[in-house]
Every structure is written in C-alpha cells, then in structure tokens.
C-alpha cells in the first residue's frame, strides 16, 4: 500500500534570464527512493539514481544543474520554459510517486513563489 505523499514547490514564477530551483519531497513513507526522474511535459530533463548519481539529458546540460538534493536547478530561463514539470520518485517497495510543479517565466521583474501544496 502506497502511503507516501509528494510535497512540491507548487505553482512558481521566475524572471526571464534568471534561475529557479524545482524541489519535491517524499514524506509519510519508509520506502527507499531508488531514483528520481525529472520531466518537462514530454521531455526527460534529468535523472538522479541512488547508485549511479545524476544524469542530465545532453540537450539540457547547459541550462540544468543537479540539486540541491534531489531537486533540479533551471538556469537562463526563457519564456519557453513555462509549463509543467514532474518529479517522478521510484521507490521500493511502494512503487512510483509523481509530483507536479507549474513554472511561469515572466518578462517583468515581479516573480513571486506560489504556495506549497501536496499531491497524494
């Protein structure tokens, strides 16, 4: 039975040209996290594996940095980076947990972080 929940940074906004940290946190389970995949809509951005460490997709290497922790840092943001991001936690023995973050990249200098929320 899957008892865990994913807490994410929720809906967030950031300035064009700036950077942002995408963070998810798995709680309420003793399951072992074996791997976390980060996806942007239908593109694999990065993977953090418990044994192998980080793999950043080559097409994103210039603008994506691993961490902090199991999170992901997006740099040199453009308006095309606006959209949904998913953290996919592969765990044992529970299985897979998925969290969603919506990022809006703004032209202006007014970019506020949204509230944190949970996805069961």
């Amino acid at each position: 039975m899957m008892t865990g929940t994913i807490e994410t940074t929720g809906n967030i906004s950031a300035e064009k040209g700036g950077s942002i940290i995408l963070q998810c946190h798995l709680s309420s389970t003793t399951a072992q996290v074996t791997q976390v995949n980060w996806e942007q809509q239908d593109q694999l951005l990065a993977i953090c594996n418990a044994d192998l460490g980080w793999h950043i997709s080559p097409s994103f290497k210039d603008r994506v940095a691993p961490g902090p922790g199991l999170g992901l840092t997006l740099q040199s943001l453009t308006v095309n980076d606006t959209g949904e991001y998913f953290c996919i936690y592969h765990t044992y023995p529970d299985g897979t947990y998925t969290g969603r973050i919506f990022l809006e990249v703004l032209e202006s200098s007014v970019a506020e972080h949204g509230a944190r929320f949970q996805i069961p």
């Epitope: 074996t34 791997q35 996806e39 239908d42 593109q43 694999l44 993977i47 594996n49 044994d51 192998l52 793999h55 997709s57 097409s59 592969h90 044992y92 023995p93």
Partner: antibody, heavy 118, light 107 residues
C-alpha cells in the same frame, strides 16, 4: 572497457531446463539494472526479464512468467537466467544487456543460442 | 502492454541519402524511446536514448526526435556501414517493448 559475456546456451528438449550466465566486467556491476533480451532466428528483439541493481525488483515478459527466473550475484559480477519448462518458441539468441537508469540498454553481450527441439 | 509500430519495415537507399525511420507508440511514452542498430550476427548497439540523446561514440549523422507517441530516427547522410536493421524500444513501462525493426538495404 565494459564487457558482457553470456554462456550456458545449447540444445535442450521441450520441457527441459537451462541456466544462462552473463559475466560482467569493466564497470561496477552492483550499481546497474540488468536485462535479458532474446531474438528468435530471423525475427526481431523481445525483452525477456530485468532485475534492479539490488535484486529488489524483478520483471518478466508474460511469455516467460512462471517459467524463467532472473537473478544476480553482485559478489561474482554475474547475471543469471534460469529457464524451466522450455518450449520450441523459446528458441532464440539470448542477450544480456546493461540498463543504466532503467531507461536505455547501453551495452550488450554477444549472445548465446538456445535451441529447444526434440 | 505498449505496442511499438515501426515504419517502413524495410527500405532501399544509396550512400549519401537522407534516411528517416518512424516509430509510433500505442500510448504516450514521454521521451522514453531508444534506437538501436543491429548488423547480421551481431548484438544490437545503442544509437539514441531518451528520444534525442546521442550515445557516446555514435556518429553525429544519427539523430532522434519526437515525444509522446511519435518518434523519428534520421540518418543525415547514409554511409556504407549504416546498412543494418534499426529497432526502436520504449522504456516507459514494463514490459519493455521493441518495434518490429526497419531493414536498411543498399539500392
């Protein structure tokens, strides 16, 4: 240099058993998921089974479930496939392959031929 | 199970030609799509992983694109050593499944 070397193939009668081995070298075997993929003569590739780095999870194709068992010995850097109740349709070249991040298969062995025939 | 449909099943081309092979998944697989090359009597060789990432050591004339359900492998200028069979494979979910293969032959 990454190397995967399969062995244990051969001719076996229907209903018989065979154990394939895959000896790995040139990388930290215990950190990688591993897979068995087969190819019947003149046919395409068919995934057979996979096992996580720590043996925590094992997955099988429906066509072999209950008959084949995948296992590994990380102290010996070796992957195994125990094949029971073999059928003519199991005749194929069996490849072991390394599966980093459970997303792609980046290194393959040369394959070992299993022939099931009376 | 996710079905992978490759087309064409075979094609004839000349050295220097631009060759395109397509692969369609029966449901969305994000970018969990890999391409392999296989020559007779040899093991498959990884060319492209995660839809568009070129595997180390693979010539840059090979490229991959697509996401969701539709994917493409392109060989920009076919070389003599490229005549082989090409397979797509999804790793979105188990069972892992392969396309039926595309045999690239000399015209």
């Amino acid at each position: 240099e990454v190397q995967l070397l399969e062995s244990g193939g051969g001719l076996v009668q229907p209903g018989g058993s065979l154990r394939l081995s895959c000896a790995a070298s040139g990388f930290t075997f215990s950190s990688y998921g591993m897979h068995w993929v087969r190819q019947a003569p003149g046919k395409g590739l068919e995934w057979v089974a996979s096992i996580k780095s720590s043996s925590s999870n094992k997955y099988y194709a429906d066509s072999v479930k209950g008959r084949f068992t995948i296992s590994r010995d990380n102290s010996k850097n070796t992957l195994y496939l125990q094949m029971n109740s073999l059928r003519a349709e199991d005749t194929a070249v069996y490849y072991c392959a390394r599966g980093p991040y459970d997303v792609w298969l980046d290194y393959w062995g040369q394959g070992t031929l299993v022939t099931v025939s009376s | 199970d996710i079905q992978m449909t490759q087309s064409p099943s075979s094609l004839s081309a000349s050295v220097g030609d631009r060759v395109t092979i397509t692969c369609r998944a029966s449901q969305s697989i994000s970018s969990y799509l890999n391409w392999y090359q296989q020559k007779p009597g040899k093991a498959p060789k990884l060319l492209i992983y995660a839809a568009s990432s070129l595997q180390s050591g693979v010539p840059s004339r090979f490229s991959g694109s697509g996401s969701g359900t539709d994917f493409t492998l392109t060989i920009s200028s076919l070389q003599p050593e490229d005549f082989a069979t090409y397979y797509c494979q999804q790793s979105y979910s188990t069972p892992l499944t392969f396309g039926g293969g595309t045999k690239v032959e000399i015209k």
